[in-house]
Interface confidence: medium
Amino acid sequence: KSSNEATNITPKHNMKAFLDELKAENIKKFLYNFTQIPHLAGTEQNFQLAKQIQSQWKEFGLDSVELAHYDVLLSYPNKTHPNYISIINEDGNEIFNTSLFEPPPPGYENVSDIVPPFSAFSPQGMPEGDLVYVNYARTEDFFKLERDMKINCSGKIVIARYGKVFRGNKVKNAQLAGAKGVILYSDPADYFAPGVKSYPDGWNLPGGGVQRGNILNLNGAGDPLTPGYPANEYAYRRGIAEAVGLPSIPVHPIGYYDAQKLLEKMGGSAPPDSSWRGSLKVPYNVGPGFTGNFSTQKVKMHIHSTNEVTRIYNVIGTLRGAVEPDRYVILGGHRDSWVFGGIDPQSGAAVVHEIVRSFGTLKKEGWRPRRTILFASWDAEEFGLLGSTEWAEENSRLLQERGVAYINADSSIEGNYTLRVDCTPLMYSLVHNLTKELKSPDEGFEGKSLYESWTKKSPSPEFSGMPRISKLGSGNDFEVFFQRLGIASGRARYTKNWETNKFSGYPLYHSVYETYELVEKFYDPMFKYHLTVAQVRGGMVFELANSIVLPFDCRDYAVVLRKYADKIYSISMKHPQEMKTYSVSFDSLFSAVKNFTEIASKFSERLQDFDKSNPIVLRMMNDQLMFLERAFIDPLGLPDRPFYRHVIYAPSSHNKYAGESFPGIYDALFDIESKVDPSKAWGEVKRQIYVAAFTVQAAAETLSEVA
């Protein structure tokens, strides 16, 4: 069968028809519709939005649209006992209290059910003690404190600024340092770009604005009570003491007005260097405790949030494939938001909605994709990627046999400067070819391709004339598909200029000020960047679902494997004597990479030449491409992280958002000179090299001629 059997127009025209159907005005309208009230996971409002999306996707023409529900652990503030932090004097009197809520933005004063700022899954507690300022609370910040400055965080409340790494890693680091509470705050150095006004007059964070967010360390487990299995009606749930990834100490976020009041009194050690200073008019002393006259004052946290098993709802839409209905290309993004979700997630959900509408329009004209396309509106992403993970756990056997690709669709924008793509190397060529066909929305690049503006503004650090494409980390719904199941994945959005804007994420991230107006007034008034992101995400899905031969190039994997092997080898070579003493060799890894390169090259040659009219051979070659990503999965997972099973990529152990290459070897080598037992530590390095070399070799062999 040809891929056009279900239609009377050529594939090229199909793609053009699909892209031409995408309209900026529709995305704008959908964004407005999705952002008028909060859609917090587990609430009635979010359930109603799920039903609305289900109904509209059906109208758009999908074959079926179902709700998939799960009962998962969520976390909410106590409505009658608000969370706050106070400074108390020696008599225990509260002489300063942090604010209980963010001042609502203009036009939203009467909106109900705005959840106050809180750290989701914080345990309850009222610890009091001296404060220690720990910078970003990264691994290296605690090394500086404990090893260099000899400051002991045990029994202290630590205050850390948001940014650089996932907040859950900050909390984990604080726990390991012995802290009894964590205060997270947004420093203007990270969340207030110079020369821009604060909301509502600009896109900067006002002093009363606060970033919400979960503080779990799930490592890919999904629902903390049902790791590995779906949280369905007959689920066996762990007790809360055995739940995965919950923090053990109270945590609470504040804005920079409140942070100023805590930090201005800090005494003790001066900051070790300028990288520990933010932009507040405070000394950024590390502590412990307050200075001089204030030394008898303490900080007290009052945290009363509760963890509750709550029902969540995914929306799953299906557009059946005409030729290979048992091959799935998935486009998914979340629907739940902390408050209005102006950017996160609804700028992404609006794009997905328009992509569904465009595909539905083509379907109504008699067209079908070659492969099945699944569309997903995930719930409870903000609470730990729960909706996507539970659905993938429930459908893991189908997905591992049938999953071709997963394209993520959270926030479409985090800036309006250039494109940002993170994906498997298998998709590099797809992304390059697609962006060469799309028009750039950027000023000064009229009539030029998206590829050209992207390459100019975000050049690859390795290859001239090519754009930067980053490794997949985590912190979003692709995690279970890529890191656990080994399904080729990618994500794309418009981003800021990282050279000139050093702040973390976008300033209003997870605050009440993330509104429709923020996007419409300041980020993308014409919705041209949203449209471009829709074209990239939609175009990738279209090609993955419709091209006769899957648009994966295994040679690009060979290139990065060599780069990653070189990188990890150079890290290890910082310890030449130990490598000699313990007979540590990377020969097996480099040999496997060489074999992979040669086999991938031969496979690519065969891919050019084979008879595409023979459906059996076509399916065989496509299966080799589809299963290549799967071949990098180790069923045993990474040490202490059983749900991170990809041997080439995993979220960094020090920052969930970042991707790490050869993570097993990297973690074994990390800070190895501090390991008490060097023989054991270097033994683990050798074991991880063995696992990596075996996996690369095994993956290479899946590309060999089958007989």
Epitope: D148, K150, N152, S154, G178, T581, E673, V676, D677
Partner: antibody, heavy 116, light 107 residues
Framework: EVKLEESGGGLVQPGGSMKISCVAS????????MNWVRQSPEKGLEWVAE??????????HYAESVKGRVIISRDDSKSSVYLQMNSLRAEDTAVYYC???????WGQGTTVTVSS | NIVMTQFPKSMSASAGERMTLTCKAS??????VSWYQQKPTQSPKMLIY???NRFTGVPDRFSGSGSGTDFILTISSVQAEDLVDYYC?????????FGGGTKLEMK
């Protein structure tokens, strides 16, 4: 095999000075923080000083009992760490051990006797 | 300074017996506690690190446990060569400190 070998101990008069040395082998010396720990019948095991690696700016830390009287130093090109001891007192009499970070490997020790 | 207190100062054991040595920290040191064995005329050798991890080459009759302030070294079946001195030490914070030692003697 990790080896630490101290030398330079001996008899010294109160108020005098002495420099003891430790040569390391079997590991990438420049990566590691090094310590001196001493042992006497009166005080038992007592940590004396630590010197960090180049990446930690060769930071040094000392026990209160020796602060201002001893200097720890290192020469990565010779895989050696030193302890310069001044204004020695009778209570500094001990076997001095050179140890690698977290005291997981110890040398055989060198004896310093402060006596008139 | 964190004071590490070991008790008893000495104890008698027979071959094959199970022995428990105790170490108490004056404040919370997490699990940053090591145990050392010292034979006459030799330097101390690490047995246990991180409160419960056996160091390379240490026989599995030695085990450690505890966290916070209370730590235990257990010898499941004492051998004649184990009748020597044992020290605990903390590397949680400066100054690193050691216990006064426990001498294991023949019954």
């Amino acid at each position: 095999e990790v080896k630490l070998e101290e030398s330079g101990g001996g008899l010294v008069q109160p108020g005098g000075s002495m420099k003891i040395s430790c040569v390391a082998s079997g590991f990438t010396f420049s990566n590691y923080w090094m310590n001196w720990v001493r042992q006497s019948p009166e005080k038992g095991l007592e940590w004396v000083a630590e010197i960090r690696s180049q990446s930690n700016n060769f930071a040094t830390h000392y026990a209160e009992s020796v602060k201002g009287r001893v200097i720890i130093s290192r020469d990565d090109s010779k895989s050696s760490v030193y302890l310069q001891m001044n204004s020695l007192r009778a209570e500094d009499t001990a076997v001095y051990y050179c140890t690698r970070r977290w005291n997981n490997f110890w040398g055989q020790g060198t004896t310093v006797t402060v006596s008139s | 300074n964190i004071v590490m207190t070991q008790f008893p100062k000495s104890m008698s054991a027979s071959a094959g017996e199970r022995m428990t040595l105790t170490c108490k920290a004056s404040e919370n040191v997490g699990t940053y506690v090591s145990w050392y064995q010292q034979k006459p005329t030799q330097s101390p050798k690490m047995l246990i690190y991180g409160a419960s991890n056996r160091f390379t080459g240490v026989p599995d009759r030695f085990s450690g446990s505890g966290s916070g302030t209370d730590f235990i070294l257990t010898i499941s079946s004492v051998q004649a060569e184990d009748l020597v001195d044992y020290y605990c030490g903390q590397s949680y914070t400066f100054p690193y400190t050691f216990g006064g030692g426990t001498k294991l003697e023949m019954k």
